[in-house]
């Protein structure tokens, strides 16, 4: 797991509530699922479904769980040691250069092109020229010029928030 986690937020400032388990740091750090106390003497458990930590750390607060946006499905819930895993809904995808939202996949390829890749949660359909095999730039064609296809089935997460 990476230390600097995308989409991370600190959980609201908290003191250890009665339900939060405490243990002693090991070699000065706290295990996944915990954060360190301000005096460095205790490890305090994260709150299930609210916050988490993924690795040995000296975080003063656990990291706030990501909430999946509308247009996303939750592949796995947030635990004390792992952030929520969100994925674009079927028929939509998220590109690396615009990770903030899921975009609709194109329904087909322009005339003279053939589909070689399905819509996935992390990529649009892929079109290539029939003759040359070069990729299409991605502008949406007119409906009458398209070769229709059905969206691909989501296979793996496109947005790992943690």
């Amino acid at each position: 797991e990476s230390a600097l986690i995308t989409q991370q937020d600190l959980a609201p400032q908290q003191r250890a509530a009665p339900q939060q388990k405490r243990s002693s740091p090991s070699e000065g750090l706290c295990p996944p699922g915990h954060h360190i106390s301000e005096d460095g003497r205790d490890c305090i458990s994260c709150k299930y479904g609210q916050d988490y930590s993924t690795h040995w750390n000296d975080l003063l607060f656990c990291l706030r769980c990501t909430r999946c946006d509308s247009g996303e499905v939750e592949l796995s819930p947030c635990t004390t040691t792992r952030n929520t895993v969100c994925q674009c809904e079927e028929g939509t995808f998220r590109e690396e250069d615009s990770p903030e939202m899921c975009r609709k996949c194109r329904t087909g390829c322009p005339r003279g092109m053939v589909k070689v890749g399905d819509c996935t949660p992390w990529s649009d359909i892929e079109c290539v020229h029939k003759e040359s095999g070069t990729k299409h730039s991605g502008e949406v064609p007119a409906v009458e010029e398209t070769v229709t296809s059905s969206p691909g089935t989501p296979a793996s997460p496109c947005s790992l928030s943690g």
Epitope: A3, L4, Q8, D9, L10, P12, Q13, S26, E27, G28, L29, I36, E38, D39, G40, R41, W56, D58, L59, L60, F61, L63
Partner: antibody, heavy 118, light 106 residues
């Protein structure tokens, strides 16, 4: 408290380098240690942290998988193994001690310069 | 990760002046903020931790304040040895630093 870094120098992109930090004046084996770097004319950036006994480590995205922090408590020495070096890794590298009951760095070394260039 | 925005990036002041440097965190970090002083070619030196606690041996003219997202370092009466670059750092979530404030002689 004294921390003295060594091992910096000029290395080509893709190359490797190992930095050392000799500690004295305190019980080295009792302290969490870190490396922090400062690119020329830039601010400070945390690079790696290791637990007092050396069992646990963690890193930021920028170096994860390329840098490895380790320590030899018998020799009072902290290390940073840097592989697959990039031009953007050019910086002065400082070793730093996490203080008692403050969860932040209280003492730093003088630093050693690493230059990554062809 | 949490960004620390420090201002100003530089300032000119005279001996005896009161100097204030501010730091703004991109999200709530409680009081987990430290301030460091760095002189050219030297190691950074801890001045303040927990936003307002002076480190051992730091003169009383240095003080820190703030909580949440807004923090201030104040030098009540600037001395010749105080001309340096000052950095804020949050240590609530990993470690991130401000870009520094260079205090120069006017």
């Amino acid at each position: 408290v004294q921390l003295v870094e060594s091992g910096g120098g000029l290395v080509q992109p893709g190359g490797s380098l190992r930095l050392s930090c000799a500690a004295s004046g305190f019980t080295f084996s009792s302290y969490v240690m870190s490396w922090v770097r400062q690119a020329p004319g830039k601010g400070l950036e945390w690079v790696a942290t290791i637990s007092s006994g050396g069992s646990y480590t963690y890193y930021p995205d920028s170096v994860k998988g390329r840098f490895t922090i380790s320590r030899d408590n018998a020799k009072n020495t902290l290390y940073l193994q840097m592989n697959s070096l990039r031009a953007e890794d050019t910086a002065v590298y400082y070793c730093a001690r996490r203080g008692d009951s403050m969860i932040t760095t209280d003492y730093w070394g003088q630093g050693t310069l690493v230059t990554v260039s062809s | 990760d949490i960004q620390m925005t420090q201002s100003p990036s530089s300032l000119s002041a005279s001996v005896g002046d009161r100097v204030t440097i501010t730091c703004k965190a991109s999200q709530d970090v409680g009081t987990a903020v430290a301030w460091y002083q760095q002189k050219p070619g030297k190691a950074p030196k801890l001045l303040i931790y927990w936003a307002s606690t002076r480190h051992t041996g730091v003169p009383s003219r240095f003080s820190g304040s703030g909580s949440g997202t807004d923090f201030t370092l104040t030098i009540s009466s600037l001395q010749p040895e105080d001309f340096a670059t000052y950095y804020c750092q949050q240590y609530s979530s990993y470690r991130t630093f401000g870009q520094g404030t260079k205090v120069e002689i006017k």
